[in-house]
Amino acid sequence: LPAQVAFTPYAPEPGSTCRLREYYDQTAQMCCSKCSPGQHAKVFCTKTSDTVCDSCEDSTYTQLWNWVPECLSCGSRCSSDQVETQACTREQNRICTCRPGWYCALSKQEGCRLCAPLRKCRPGFGVARPGTETSDVVCKPCAPGTFSNTTSSTDICRPHQICNVVAIPGNASMDAVCTSTSPTRSMAPGAVHLPQPVSTRSQHTQPTPEPSTAPSTSFLLPMGPSPPAEGSTGD
């Protein structure tokens, strides 16, 4: 004969546990129904009556089957640095992530608590390590034979053009100027080639930044006490 299905509330057999989506109420000493996501326990069960559930109020939620007396408050509205990637509903919390050009400086369980602008490398410096969702850009000085003439959070150092006849030699922040009509591009020694991130959101590769001397302004550092890459500017 099949075992008789017990309806909540019921007293569990000694040594057994309550079934899925049920909880053991210490006061009633009974197995009682949990409330579904989007609801909370309005009235706890007794020996003779089951849990009474009620819908979460506006701006509150429960994500799991539960028996909490009150729903959880949704997080505060996303700041101007952020975009709302998941709205606050009765069943899920709001999730804020950083908008393009920003990264998450202070993370939380889901989403981001504080977004910061990605560092921009100034002319003479290129991106050594692209920004990711949770880390800043690392800049490095352009090596001999390479240059960057932009203030950018994505541009790397590019090789100088090779001239038949040089009008103006290139430097770290300027390309060479040729007098010849047909310059040729060459891979100069020390040229840096990094994948350019399409979006900071899905960029997770982190090439190791080359060490450099400390600049005269402050920087977000790579890990550890080593000196930072220089060449950052504000946003």
Epitope: A105, L106, L114, C115, R119, S218, T233, G234
Partner: antibody
Amino acid sequence: EVQLLESGGGLVQPGGSLRLSCAASGFTFDDYGMSWVRQAPGKGLEWVSTIYSGDNAYYGASVRGRFTISRDNSKNTLYLQMNSLRAEDTAVYYCARVYSSSWRKRAFDIWGQGTLVTVSS
Amino acid sequence: QSVLTQPPSASGTPGQRVTISCSGTSSNIESNTVNWYQQLPGTAPKLLIYSDNQRPSGVPDRFSGSKSGTSASLAISGLRSEDEADYYCAAWDDSLSGWVFGGGTKLTVL
């Protein structure tokens, strides 16, 4: 009660090292950025360093490459490892919590009482 | 020399209104919010005004902050003897990627 308590200060010779600690209580430590701000005797306030999550740390120009900020969220503690100390690093070092509603709206809302670091031979 | 410029001293008599100025640049005050800190003699600094003009709970409404362009100011009305302290302005500087403070203003209540 929200509280920050610094320790680890003392007398050290030029070129020496010191590690400051800041024990936090009364709030969810990993919800906040944390900073060190110093004040030389009779002088004004000077920002030293700020740390957010993980390795997201910022440093002032005068300490970069010598000081390292870190945090242990499991111990609710902020640290400042100070190497290659100089006489001009002599100051009271304050630990401060960073309130932030957005990047442009941040402030040091809670301060510790400070710990004195003296660099002298 | 401090990045933000404050007068080294200010004074007033009880009941008076006193204003302390703080001058900066487009990379700090103009593009970020300004905070003011009060440091009573022998104590740690305390946040007085944040986000240009917001008062933390517990700070009397006698204290107010304002900002215009690259300058900010702190006003204290109904001056009291217990307001005698050092006052510092501070802001994030985008060019330096760091916090900058004013040199501090010593307020004396005559």
